[in-house]
């Protein structure tokens, strides 16, 4: 009689992560008597996957009734495949004895596992930066297989070219990760801008996966200040306004100084938003000129988003206004935010 052959008809099998893999194996004879075992890998370090005779293998089921005496089909199904299951599986016939001895092995079936990349996560710099500065964004995606993957960066739909990408590990692995760093130059118009990392992989049936970062979380647009003197409201009263324009984020504190002395401090609240996402705000100060013998230096000092204060001054000519006889009251500190 012809000697038993172990036939593994599939040289390779490819399975999606989470699915079941069927590994086919048939023998051509019932002799010699003895069990079949399945291993992953070859040599002394091979891993037992299934033993027909004994053991508990919760993820493995036999395709046919392998316990039947005449059975010659020893195909198995492995459930809930993960990338860690990739490898070459061997169906091995043993000869019954004490102990059983290996008789013949199949040629092996290479199991490759296809796994989708995780949703890309984009992260920006820890601290805010101002326009004209270059900031770095990173994008990461994990757990995909095979290794081939493409990653692109976009800013508001325009593809970026200044980035570096690594896929790890470099050698063979059950699954892979991608890490990319892109450099982006900020502009004053970037409050509404988005940076997008796009990952494409063979397993993705839809469009590429996207991760986004809003530049509103990265940019700081410092304000421009303008102090102007309004026409006299009433006798001896002058209205001075401080226009704080085009700033982002909203966190802003304004202090009025009269000849270097703090007159009033207020926090920006009722701001107007510009189309580009920056804010404008206006504060005004009513000054009673009759309280001053000399010219007054009015300073609008702004502290924006925890940064060092910037200021703008305005010289108020007291001599240009008639003085009230016998009046020595202090400058009036009433003021208000205006839209």
């Amino acid at each position: 009689e012809e000697e038993l052959q172990v036939i593994q008809p599939d040289k390779s099998v490819s399975v999606a992560a989470g699915e079941s893999a069927i590994l086919h194996c048939t023998v051509t004879s019932l002799i010699p008597v003895g069990p079949i075992q399945w291993f992953r890998g070859a040599g002394p370090a091979r891993e037992l996957i299934y033993n027909q005779k004994e053991g508990h293998f919760p993820r493995v089921t036999t395709v046919s009734e392998s316990t039947k005496r005449e059975n010659m089909d020893f195909s198995i199904s492995i459930s809930n495949i993960t990338p860690a299951d990739a490898g070459t599986y061997y169906c091995v016939k043993f000869r019954k004895g004490s102990p059983d001895t290996e008789f013949k092995s199949g040629a092996g079936t290479e199991l490759s596992v296809r796994a989708k990349p995780s949703a890309p996560v984009v992260s920006g710099p820890a601290a805010r930066a101002t326009p004209q500065h270059t900031v770095s964004f990173t994008c990461e995606s994990h757990g995909f297989s095979p290794r081939d993957i493409t990653l692109k960066w976009f800013k508001n739909g325009n593809e970026l070219s200044d980035f570096q990408t690594n896929v790890d590990p470099v050698g063979e692995s059950v699954s892979y990760s991608i890490h990319s760093t892109a450099k982006v130059v900020l502009t004053r118009e970037d409050v509404h801008s988005q940076v997008i990392c796009e990952v494409a992989h063979v397993t993705l049936q839809g469009d590429p996966l996207r991760g986004t970062a809003n530049l509103s979380e990265t940019i700081r647009v410092p304000p421009t200040l303008e102090v102007t003197q309004q026409p006299v409201r009433a006798e001896n009263q002058v209205n001075v306004t401080c226009q704080v324009r085009k700033f982002y984020p909203q966190r802003l504190q304004l202090t009025w100084l009269e000849n270097g002395n703090v007159s009033r401090t207020e926090t920006a609240s009722t701001v107007t938003e510009n189309k580009d996402g920056t804010y404008n705000w206006m504060s005004w100060l009513l000054v009673n000129v009759s309280a001053h013998r000399d010219d007054v230096k009015l300073t609008c000092q702004v502290e924006h988003d925890g940064q060092p204060a910037v200021s703008k001054s305005h010289d108020l000519k007291v001599s240009a206004h008639p003085k009230e006889q016998g009046s020595n009251t202090a400058a009036e500190n009433t003021g208000s935010n205006e839209r």
Partner: antibody
Framework: QSVEESGGRLGTPGTPLTLTCTVS????????MGWFRQAPGKGLEYIGI?????SPYYASWVNGRFTISKTSTTMDLKMNSPTTEDTATYFC?????????????WGPGTLVTVSL | DIVMTQTPSSVEAAVGGTVTIKCQAG??????LAWYQQKPGQRPKLLIY???TLESGVPSRFKGSGSGTDYTLTISDLESADAATYYC???????????FGGGTEVVVK
């Protein structure tokens, strides 16, 4: 699971023509679908695909000659301005469950003849 | 676009024999290669994908191999039912585009 093309007929140059691919047994919202063609006695030629989310991608030679779109149950190929060179059997196909690198379900094809 | 060069354009072999069809890509396609069988007046039928993975239900007489730019389809123990035209098809993971070889007609004597 199957796909089937329809809409093939005798057309005239310059007159738009729309082919439809109807699927059964699976959802168009889960798979990439493709359009291909085969001129009489010639080989297979890739036209374009539409992703599960509805974004079309075309072969570089298409240059606006075709438009791919889909509804929940059908995928269309519009021949915007056919010429006699577009005479062919048009196939729609679905990519495999493991990835977009191969097509495992093909329709029987529908014949389009563009003639003066 | 990647150009796929398939050879030979036609091959003849006897029942029980072996046929080898080659496909060369203009650049590396990282094993993203599929083989199809098409008989006259019929739709293409997937045989092999990812260079060497046999599609379910396809006899193991069909064997795919290769990597990088060079791929081979081997049909052994030829049967008369194997008479058909065979096409290779690539997918390029960077351009995400597809290309077909010109086809090989297999005639079984």
């Amino acid at each position: 699971q199957s796909v089937e093309e329809s809409g093939g007929r005798l057309g005239t140059p310059g007159t738009p023509l729309t082919l439809t691919c109807t699927v059964s047994g699976f959802s168009l919202s889960s798979y990439v679908m493709g359009w291909f063609r085969q001129a009489p006695g010639k080989g297979l030629e890739y036209i374009g695909i539409i992703s599960s989310s509805g974004s079309p991608y075309y072969a570089s030679w298409v240059n606006g000659r075709f438009t791919i779109s889909k509804t929940s149950t059908t995928m269309d190929l519009k021949m915007n301005s056919p010429t006699t060179e577009d005479t062919a059997t048009y196939f729609c196909a679905r990519v495999g469950p493991l990835g977009v690198d191969y097509f495992n379900i093909w329709g029987p094809g529908t014949l389009v003849t563009v003639s003066l | 676009d990647i150009v796929m060069t398939q050879t030979p354009s036609s091959v003849e072999a006897a029942v029980g024999g072996t046929v080898t069809i080659k496909c060369q890509a203009g650049q590396s396609i990282n094993s993203y290669l599929a083989w199809y069988q098409q008989k006259p007046g019929q739709r293409p039928k997937l045989l092999i994908y990812y260079a060497s993975t046999l599609e379910s239900g396809v006899p193991s007489r069909f064997k795919g191999s290769g990597s990088g730019t060079d791929y081979t389809l081997t049909i052994s123990d030829l049967e008369s039912a194997d008479a058909a035209t065979y096409y290779c098809q690539s997918w390029h993971y960077i351009s995400r585009s597809y290309a077909f070889g010109g086809g090989t007609e297999v005639v079984v004597k």
